[in-house]
């Protein structure tokens, strides 16, 4: 509940409560924006970033970004919000705990996102096809 | 009874720094994560810092990240937030508040898992 000592901010999206007025604490999320990076061609690649920040906002996810060009490989780490898109792309797979990399269409570059909501989901970015969220066994385990 | 106590705001020039504290009691507090939560007048909750029960692992807002320093004394069941290089955009009440990990919602319907508040104010 928010005590009755905390002033209720109206129209305010950093209060973020369920019906009964508890309070929604935020993820936890690494947060290096864009870096340079070695992941390619692997299953599975760790982040390698070394900051974790409390989103601003509680209903922030953790989001991840891998793109690749002819000059280099960018990995993108973040908070957002899933109710807005994010490089003109919806957060289709934001409840997911862990972050599984999928395919966007980007002209002149290979553009892979994911985001997920459990804490620190996004040091961890899953390329592999066997964590494909089509498995419906698999979305049995993430949901239940 | 449960309860969190904070202390230590008050009025500071900018570039200034302040220690919050928060004395816990009535829990066992080694069991709890714990977060040092603001609210400027008028805007919402801003959630500022966090320490994990075990470990002492700290995490931080990008707004505060590199001047304040979240810390805790388990023996003295005390939660500390020391403030450096404050600016105006700092002014604020400081809550202290508590989460059991795992779980991403503050106990219902109490309110006990909040502090008072303690009053911080950057202003020259």
């Known amino acids: 509940t928010i005590p009755p000592h905390v002033q209720k901010s109206v129209n305010n999206d950093m209060i973020v409560t369920d019906n009964n007025g508890a309070v929604k604490f935020p993820q936890l999320c690494k947060f290096c924006d864009v870096r340079f990076s070695t992941c390619d061609n692997q299953k599975s690649c760790m982040s390698n970033c070394s900051i974790t920040s409390i989103c601003e906002k509680p209903q922030e996810v953790c989001v991840a970004v891998w793109r690749k060009n002819d000059e280099n490989i960018t990995l993108e780490t973040v908070c957002h919000d899933p109710k807005l898109p994010y490089h003109d792309f919806i957060l289709e797979d934001a409840a997911s705990p862990k972050c599984i990399m999928k395919e966007k269409k980007k002209p002149g570059e290979t553009f892979f996102m994911c985001s997920c909501s459990s804490d620190e989901c996004n040091d961890n970015i899953i390329f592999s096809e066997e964590y494909n969220t089509s498995n419906p066994d698999l979305l049995l385990v993430i949901f239940q | 009874e449960v309860q969190l106590l904070e202390s230590g705001g008050g009025l500071v020039q900018p570039g200034g720094s302040l220690r919050l504290s928060c004395t816990a009691s009535g829990f066992t507090f080694t069991e709890y994560r714990m977060w040092w939560v603001r609210q400027a007048p008028g805007k919402g909750l801003e959630w500022v810092s966090l320490i994990e029960p075990i470990g002492n692992r700290t995490y931080y807002a990008n707004s505060v990240r590199g001047r304040f320093t979240i810390s805790r004394d388990n023996s003295k069941n005390t939660l500390y937030l020391q403030m450096n290089s404050l600016r105006a955009e700092d002014t604020a009440v400081y809550y202290c508040?508590?989460?059991?990990?795992?779980?991403?919602?503050?106990?219902?319907?109490?309110?006990?898992?909040w502090g008072q508040g303690t009053q911080v104010t950057v202003s020259s």
């Open positions: 508040a508590k989460q059991i990990p795992g779980h991403m919602w503050t106990a219902n319907p109490r309110s006990d898992y």
